[in-house]
């Protein structure tokens, strides 16, 4: 009985032509949506003139359908039992699932001003930047449409810089017609306990963003895990969105459309400072903003973003230290809404439902040379938006799963 089921499962979760796993892996059968909430700044002038707390009001959801494109360049390597692929990016706006349109306007931090003043440190360059910021009538904050903010716009200040700088900015620019990878993952043919585990990403086993073990590419991409998942396991996975590997731990048993699944969550410990979780020492990349590595709940991913001062956190600075959220008014973190979870069917290791939540923030610092940042008296990690990417197994697929997998076990 059980042995036969195990044998069948082992056969069907291998990532090769003809298996159930492969069919769903190449092109997910689940509809995946990415909801965005934008933090609309209510008091831009007071912040710029008096270094006041930033008052934000979230507006959303603005929903896009994502991950609808099949993996590309899928290539099996029989020699090392791996399969490599590219994951194409695409996003389609869903008006019926959104509070407004892509043309809605938001007052947000000026991405170009914050990034350029951070990266271009030379004194004379800063003088040039200051004159061009003024000439282009740019400021510390700007009004942008949702479409511009997410997918890119030509910045008026950067367009005047007399060097070959990047003039188009956007939080996810470029996105459409790009692809993530190349990923090379184990197909499980020789060893089912390695199935879907990433061997290399962009041709390397390390990221080159972090020191020591923090730089490792661990586990799968979280879409599936090797079969026969135990509650005691720590599930490692890599997320290119946050430029690091992270992990989830068992939280509870959940019934999903009649299928028993294990809910795994990202624990607060994963976001802790090295003071509380020494393993995290290598995610602390500088001493000033992190207050000597005592701040927690924000991850400086600038090295992964060409030096732009991007910080990733959980929405509303959930699990972050008070000093991070202190300069921002209007945030209300709560676990239920803002944490990330994966609902995993333990026999197959498939993720049947998930909610990936993260927040994109940008650091802005006072600058003596740049007039629009001159009055700032402190550093701000400014929330720009947070997102909730969700997917749930469809009813039809759930029926198939119940009859072919869980039904047979019970």
């Amino acid at each position: 009985g059980d042995l036969l089921i195990q044998k069948t499962i082992k056969k069907q979760v291998v990532l090769e032509e003809g298996t159930i796993a492969f069919k769903n892996w190449v092109k997910t059968g689940t509809e995946v949506y990415r909801q965005f909430w934008i933090f609309d700044v209510q008091n831009p002038q007071e912040v710029m003139m008096n270094s006041s707390n930033i008052q934000v009001k979230q507006r959303g959801p603005y929903t896009y359908r994502v991950r609808f494109l099949a993996k590309e360049n899928v290539t099996q390597d029989a020699e090392d039992n791996t399969v490599s692929f590219l994951q194409p990016n695409g996003a389609i706006f869903e008006p019926s699932l959104s509070v407004g349109t892509e043309a809605d306007n938001f007052t947000v931090l000026n991405l170009a001003v914050a990034a350029a003043s951070h990266i271009y440190q030379n004194q004379f360059v800063q003088m040039i930047l200051n004159s061009l910021i003024n000439k282009s009538k740019s400021s510390m904050f700007q009004v942008r449409t949702l479409r511009e903010l997410l997918w890119g716009y030509r910045d008026p200040f950067l367009s005047l810089v007399p060097y070959p700088v990047t003039t188009t900015v956007g939080l996810f620019y470029p996105y459409n017609n790009t692809a993530d990878g190349v990923y090379k993952v184990f197909n499980g043919k020789d060893n089912i306990s390695k199935v879907a585990i990433i061997d290399t990403y962009k041709g390397k086993r390390n990221l080159s963003y972090w020191e020591s073990h923090c730089d490792m590419i661990n586990g799968t991409d979280a879409a599936s895990f090797p079969p026969f998942v135990e509650k005691s396991q720590v599930l490692q996975f890599f997320s290119s969105d946050i430029c690091r590997s992270i992990y989830a731990v068992f939280e509870s048993d959940v019934n999903l459309k009649g299928i028993p699944v294990y809910r795994f969550v990202l624990p607060s410990k994963a976001f802790a400072s090295p003071v509380e979780n020494p393993d995290n020492y290598c995610f602390c990349t500088e001493k000033i903003i992190s207050k000597n590595c005592t701040s927690y709940g924000v991850l400086d991913i600038s090295k992964c973003k060409e030096g732009r001062p991007v910080y990733i956190s959980l929405p509303h600075f959930l699990y972050a230290s008070p000093d991070v959220s202190e300069p921002i008014d209007g945030l209300n973190p709560n676990e239920e809404e803002h944490r990330t979870y994966l609902d995993i069917e333990p026999i197959t290791g498939f993720t049947l439902q998930f909610a990936k939540r993260l927040q994109v923030n940008l650091l802005v610092k006072p600058s003596e040379k740049i007039q629009v940042l001159k009055n700032l008296k402190r550093n701000y990690i400014v929330p720009i938006l947070w997102l909730n990417e969700t997917g749930t197994i469809g009813d039809e697929k759930a029926n198939m799963f119940r009859s072919q997998v869980t039904g047979k076990i019970n």
């Epitope: 271009y120 030379n122 360059v125 040039i128 007399p162 060097y163 070959p164 700088v165 990047t166 030096g307």
Partner: nanobody
């Protein structure tokens, strides 16, 4: 890797003149001398390094510290990969080590290079 070599420093009496030169070499991967904004900085003992004069990559715009305006002139010769600082009406407070700087931007990167410096002493 860009190398910058300053020359022309020395001992000069108050009211005198000097012309500093900075020769640039080692340009690679699509960058030429005319890709760089060039600057002169100075640092007196126990003081912070200060920007004295600068010229844009195209040579169409210059900047001077208030303390040297009307006395110092920065210029560049892109054919010779050299930037100059002509210093007139020198004062004892101009005594410092003078450093040449080259900077350019590409994408989201800043490429910033420094020379070893040349000493200028204004004394009677």
């Amino acid at each position: 890797q860009v190398q910058l070599q300053e020359s022309g420093g020395g001992l000069v009496q108050p009211g005198g003149s000097l012309r500093l030169s900075c020769a640039a070499s080692g340009f690679t991967s699509g960058f030429t001398f005319s890709s760089y904004a060039m600057s002169w900085y100075r640092q007196a003992p126990g003081k912070e390094r200060e920007l004295v004069a600068a010229i844009t990559n195209a040579g169409d715009s210059t900047h001077y510290a208030d303390s040297v305006k009307g006395r110092f002139t920065i210029s560049r010769d892109n054919a010779k990969n050299t930037v100059y600082l002509l210093m007139n009406s020198l004062k004892p407070e101009d005594t410092a080590a003078y450093y040449c700087n080259a900077v350019t931007l590409q994408g989201w990167s800043e490429y910033d290079y420094w020379g070893q410096g040349t000493q200028v002493t204004v004394s009677s």
